[in-house]
Interface confidence: low
Amino acid sequence: ASTQSPSVFPLTRCCKNIPSNATSVTLGCLATGYFPEPVMVTWDTGSLNGTTMTLPATTLTLSGHYATISLLTVSGAWAKQMFTCRVAHTPSSTDWVDNKTFSVCSRDFTPPTVKILQSSCDGGGHFPPTIQLLCLVSGYTPGTINITWLEDGQVMDVDLSTASTTQEGELASTQSELTLSQKHWLSDRTYTCQVTYQGHTFEDSTKKCADSNPRGVSAYLSRPSPFDLFIRKSPTITCLVVDLAPSKGTVNLTWSRASGKPVNHSTRKEEKQRNGTLTVTSTLPVGTRDWIEGETYQCRVTHPHLPRALMRSTTKTSGPRAAPEVYAFATPEWPGSRDKRTLACLIQNFMPEDISVQWLHNEVQLPDARHSTTQPRKTKGSGFFVFSRLEVTRAEWEQKDEFICRAVHEAASPSQTVQRAVSVNPGLAGGSAQSQRAPDRVLCHSGQQQGLPRAAGGSVPHPRCHCGAGRADWPGPPELDVCVEEAEGEAPWTWTGLC
């Protein structure tokens, strides 16, 4: 077994079970789960005298690790004294020590209630420049408590010296305040007040509530597509307001940034829908760097007929990152559709869910309308997946039988893209960007006269090219012929194709 340091636990009795006239009392320290032997247990008894006894180590059956208990018996004024047991495990490291400081006995206690309160918005539904969160820890038996603030589960740097404790009768209450910038609050992070008391943890969490809408009107704010962000390097975000009743009075869409920095000029579009409602979109160019660094953008929608402003905010998704895996496939030929094939691309296990999918042919990006891509869906694990489907024609694959499915995602290293190549006829042109590739100059077509291949694009046939038996030195099924140019004095050019 490999070296394992011990876990150390204090062993105490309940105070109510110790007679009030007891002149001596025993407490203990358990060191468990360590390997190899030995551990050294020492006690700091302050001003009191004590005798110690360390029991022989026992082996934990399942793991083969060891456990031992050290007992300390003290006499005298033990009730107010704190004791420290020090456990050293030199096999872990020459300076590996764990100290546990505790009193002789544990009292029954009333656990705290933990509640977070937050400062309110102003009357117009705006958040002030800073937001205060107040953690109320109430109704606990007086004793040491530790308060920690977490942001999305990560410990925050907070000055806890401002925490104040009051006692009401038998119970105590403590409060701690956290001040957040508007930017942090609007970024949709979760804030947790975590309280440690008597070895137990109690907590409460809060985050900005989802905005509620005036009835019938909805507003949506998109994040920039990874394609715009990383490839075009000109990201935009769009604020979309739907189901507005066309009426007198202008819909105002106002953009702002949580940092207070100025925003770019936005473009606006209004469309009347068939059902008579109005859709308004406003598109705002954002700085690539600003977005990547976590700037928060807000869109505020006002209209004379809205009871109050609608506010929407967006920022870079927080949380873990994982690069996409990309797999590309070609469906086999289907009876009755020899001149069309479907290519499929599975992109999976990426985080966060923002992704752009492109198809390329002949190094040219195909229009988005050519392919159909699903919305990201959760996998069984923690990531997301999408499928993308592309229909290709014989003319395309005969021109060049390599189609590329490319995913653009922030976690893809190093250039935010991952791509896979796929061929309609695998083995003819290689199925990935790494495979060997024949030059694309001449293609042999099926049904043509032997020895007279037709050049790509219908141009004049190449004079010194014949269709012969499958070549063993070219990757691909042996039943497929290859075209070999018989150029004198040179290594022959090789093309793959149907003969």
Epitope: P129, D157, S181, G260, R321
Partner: antibody, heavy 118, light 106 residues
Amino acid sequence: DVQLLESGPGLVKPSQSLSLTCTVTGYSITSDYAWNWIRQFPGNKLEWLGYINYSGTTRYNPSLKSRISISRDTSKNQFFLQLNSVTSEDTATYFCVYGSSQRFFDYWGQGTTLTVSS
Amino acid sequence: DIVMTQSHKFMSTSVGDRVSITCKASQDVSIDVAWYQQKPGQSPKLLIYSASWRYAGVPDRFTGSRSGTDYTLTISSVQAEDLAVYYCQQHYNLFTFGSGTKLEIQ
């Protein structure tokens, strides 16, 4: 763009206190994230000293905790470094640095050289 | 303290070459590593953060990667202006820097 400019005495005697000022333009120090002090010793080694964040919370390098203090004056958009009981070991170029995410350092001042000598 | 070790104090290369500068963390620091470039007489400039994210405005010849506790800054085609000292920095627990690797161009 954020710009940071350090100013300080240049020469300090051993055992005295060192005070440096960083004046920030182009961005409010109460807007967000962390305003750091980092020093670079003559051999080029970089050492993070501490920061004060947008809400005034400070965090220091544990090796200096007993003698460092970082404060700010929001009305002047400045933050300060005070280092007590300096020795020749504190001779270095001191940079004030803006960290846009409390994790790394985006904008650095040009640095101010400090010599501790009697 | 987490120690970031840059084993090469100096690296010599030529314009157009591919060069990799390495840094090893004394413990697992996840992807919490940044790279800085300091040209003679200038302040350090952020190149890469979170192990592989290129900072805005940084040329795409600079890439960062991670393998366990080993971190690499690669310059795919060195330019004359890349003459500088390169530092790694961990931001997993407080902040510590590597000792720097000076890139010399022949």
